[in-house]
């Protein structure tokens, strides 16, 4: 931006200027050009010999300006177009300044001004221009300062030149209020800081509902002496519940919100939000839809899932396998997870209490993402109620549960471990195992053999322990080998059905299972 | 010295035509603006036409726009002025007159021009 | 166009006197003014152009001033050669137009 301090041209002939010598020299004319009337002071003493005359501006107002810039508009005639070469003729003349802190009027004296330079023509006018008026003009401009004092003077020597002076404009540079990246810089002089920097740092302040971003810079911008903002550094954002619009933070339109100062626009609310008022934030959940802590705000509102699908429980002796589907409504979200519990009743006394300590599953029971878990180590002859919890990330945030829950009957023991504890080639010793709350219950124990193959006869064998030796058996021969446990009320779950094989007559002490 | 030198005129019926000549000499004729200068018996002087120094642009006063017509021939160092359409008004002393920028010590040239150098007349009566 | 009136049209003086003839212009046409003498059957002769500009070869009791639309051709100390009639000429615009003369006369 450019303040004029002075226009000459813009006066239209209305200023007037000083000259020196009075009467004599520099003069005002008005011509026509472009058929508009225009003004100018011209000399043009070109056979009069040595020249020394001045024209001096009016007293000139500095204001806010430190360095002013002459920018001259004129035109110089050829000398070679005078009869002669007009032998005392010159193409140029001199620009000079003075400061001071009074208008002297017209008290004129030239060692008070201080020459700035010799102003030479880019083009001279030759005869042909002339006639033909075609006005050469030259445009030259000049940079003075620093100033000091209130005002100063402008002065022009001619020196025998025949010089028109079409336009005088003096201005100083202003670096424009500007408005970038939201935020609002003040109008500045322009003004070198020192000859090294030669660029003015100004802090901006953000536009109304925009803040500098957390931990960002605030907005800085470089005023040149050009009167150029350069160099934009940090910036503003619009805040919460607004949007950039063209240089503007604008509120976000009702059914839209924003949560955070940031570059993005405002969003529309999700799905299961209630429509928002202008310049909302967030978007509140519709009654029965919540959101989780870590959900983000542009996320819909979700609620708790229904309940598991088709939960079955296959009894396998003293083992149940629970098994189910997901919820038919999971509620908008994916991170449903699983929580088995389980409540064993004795059958007598109807008495029921949890069995968590009791039992084992597979997997921890309280985040499960499969939908299946098997328990092992039931006690038989017990009653067990198995409930599987579907939750999501909003379950916390209702008191309500969605669970569905299955029953099963345990009669039986578990079945034993069975392993080969030694064999030869006539014998096998084989050992089981049960768990120690089961043990109690069991009266004797049956061992089934027979040989692999055959299966029209088969071998039994009691005992109470927990071991037994099967002799008289072929060499190099597999036998299957099945543990059952025998209990009061009658057959126990029996073990699943094992491989065992005797040793060659040649073979050797090596046990192959 | 500069010497312009008018002929050409006389006595002519209204309507008729007539063509003056001015001859020049002891300056650069190609270098002036030449132009046609009237004076009517007893009266003032009435600009009437000027021709640029290559032959343009030419102007003309109202009163005789459309019936006059001024040309140079810069190799035979001649201006003419043709006239038809003679009217009574037209009888007057036709001057030559010439302008030379170099004698004219301005920075900027006027929007039109004065005459530094004149022939000495020729005379055109229109009578019947 | 432009209209130039001059004052006034005829005067008598004695040779030495001061003579000052007017010419007023019906608009401005800053200093764009020329003075011209012409004797009895001859051409006009260029004396004055730019308003105050003395062509070359007048002599320097000749002198004009002013500007816009009034200016004056003033002879300071009349001369015997210098009774003649003076015309003032405007050349601000194409039509380049002349007073109507003033005659300077011994008295």
């Known amino acids: 931006k450019e303040v004029v301090l002075l226009d000459f041209a813009a006066m239209k002939g209305e200023l007037g200027w000083l000259t020196h010598p009075y009467g004599k020299g520099w003069d005002l004319m008005q011509n026509i050009m472009d058929d508009m009337p225009i003004y100018m002071y011209s000399v043009c003493n070109v056979v009069s010999g040595d020249q020394d005359n001045w024209l001096r501006t009016n007293w000139v107002y500095r204001e806010e300006a430190e360095r002013i810039f002459i920018e001259l508009k004129f035109t110089v005639r050829d000398c070679n177009s005078f009869p002669g070469g007009a032998s005392s003729c010159k193409e140029t003349f001199n620009l000079y300044y003075a400061e001071s802190d009074v208008d002297y009027g017209t008290n004129f004296q030239k060692r008070q001004f201080t020459k700035i330079d010799t102003i030479a023509p880019d083009e001279i006018t030759v005869s042909s221009d002339f006639e033909a008026r075609n006005v050469k003009l030259n445009v030259e401009e000049r940079m003075v300062g620093p100033l000091t004092r209130k005002g100063f003077y402008l002065a022009f020597q001619d020196i025998g030149a025949c010089v028109a002076l079409l336009s005088v404009r003096v201005y100083y540079k202003k670096c424009p209020e500007m408005l970038q990246s939201l935020a609002r810089f003040p109008e500045t002089i322009a003004v070198a800081v020192s000859d090294t920097q030669p660029l003015a740092t100004v802090a901006g302040t953000c536009v109304d509902h925009a803040v500098v971003p957390y931990g960002g810079e605030g907005p800085l911008m470089h005023c040149t002496v050009d009167g150029e903002w350069l160099v934009p550094i940090g910036q503003c954002l619009c805040q919460e519940g607004y949007e950039k619009v063209e240089d503007a933070c604008r509120a976000c339109s009702p059914g839209f919100f924003k949560s955070e100062a940031s570059e993005s626009p405002c969003l529309e609310c999700p799905e299961h939000t209630l429509p928002s008022t202008e310049g909302a934030t967030s978007c509140q959940c519709e009654e029965g839809y919540f959101r989780a802590p870590e959900d983000p705000l542009s996320m819909s509102c979700t609620r708790p899932p229904s309940a598991p699908n088709y939960l079955t429980a296959i009894g396998m002796g003293a083992k149940v396998e629970l098994r189910w589907t997901a919820p038919k409504d999971t509620g908008g979200r994916q991170d449903i997870v699983y929580s088995v519990t389980c409540e064993q009743c004795w059958p007598e006394s109807g008495e029921c209490g949890p069995c968590e300590a009791s039992v084992r599953y597979s997997e921890p029971p309280h985040a499960l993402t499969r939908t299946s878990v098997t328990v092992s180590d039931l006690e038989p002859h017990m009653n067990y109620t198995f409930a599987v919890e579907a939750r999501n990330g909003v379950s916390g945030l209702v008191t309500s549960r969605s669970f569905r829950t299955a029953s099963v009957s345990i009669n039986q023991t578990e079945p034993p471990k069975v392993r080969l504890e030694d064999r030869s080639t006539t014998s096998l010793s084989v050992t089981w195992s049960i768990p120690v709350s089961q043990q109690s219950r069991v009266w004797k124990y049956e061992v089934t053999y027979r040989k692999k193959g055959d299966a029209n006869s088969y071998n039994v064998r009691r005992t109470e322990g927990f071991s037994v030796t099967l002799d008289d058996l072929a060499p190099d021969t597999t036998y299957l080998v099945q543990v059952q446990a025998l209990t009061q009320e009658g057959q126990g779950a029996g073990s699943k059905v094992h491989e065992f094989q005797t040793l060659s007559t040649e073979g050797s002490a090596n046990m192959a299972v | 010295e500069v010497q312009l030198l008018e002929s050409g005129g006389g006595l002519v019926q209204p309507g008729g035509s007539l063509r003056l000549s001015c001859a020049a000499s002891g300056f650069t004729f190609s270098h002036y603006m030449m132009a046609w200068v009237r004076q009517a018996p007893g009266k003032g002087l009435e600009w009437v036409s000027r021709i640029g120094p290559s032959g343009g642009p030419t102007h003309y006063a109202d009163s005789v726009k459309g019936r006059f017509t001024i040309s140079r021939d810069n190799s035979k160092n001649t201006l003419y002025l043709q006239m038809n359409s003679l009217r009574a008004e037209d009888t007057a002393v036709y001057y030559c007159a010439g302008y030379d920028s170099g004698y004219d010590y301005v920075a900027v040239a006027g929007p039109a021009e004065y005459f530094q150098h004149w022939g000495q007349g020729t005379l055109v009566t229109v009578s019947s | 166009d432009i209209q130039m009136t001059q004052s006034p049209s005829s005067l008598s003086a004695s040779v030495g006197d001061r003579v000052t003839i007017t010419c007023r212009a019906s608009q401005s046409i800053s200093t764009w003014l020329a003075w011209y003498q012409q004797k009895p059957g001859k051409a006009p002769k260029l004396l004055i152009y730019k308003a105050s500009n003395l062509h070359t070869g007048v002599p320097s009791r000749f002198s004009g001033s002013g500007s816009g639309t009034e200016f004056s051709l003033t002879i300071s100390g009349l001369q015997p050669d210098d009774f003649a009639t003076y015309y003032c000429?405007?050349?601000?615009?194409?039509?380049?137009?002349f007073g109507q003369g003033t005659k300077v006369e011994i008295k």
């Open positions: 000429q405007q050349y601000n615009a194409y039509s380049r137009t």
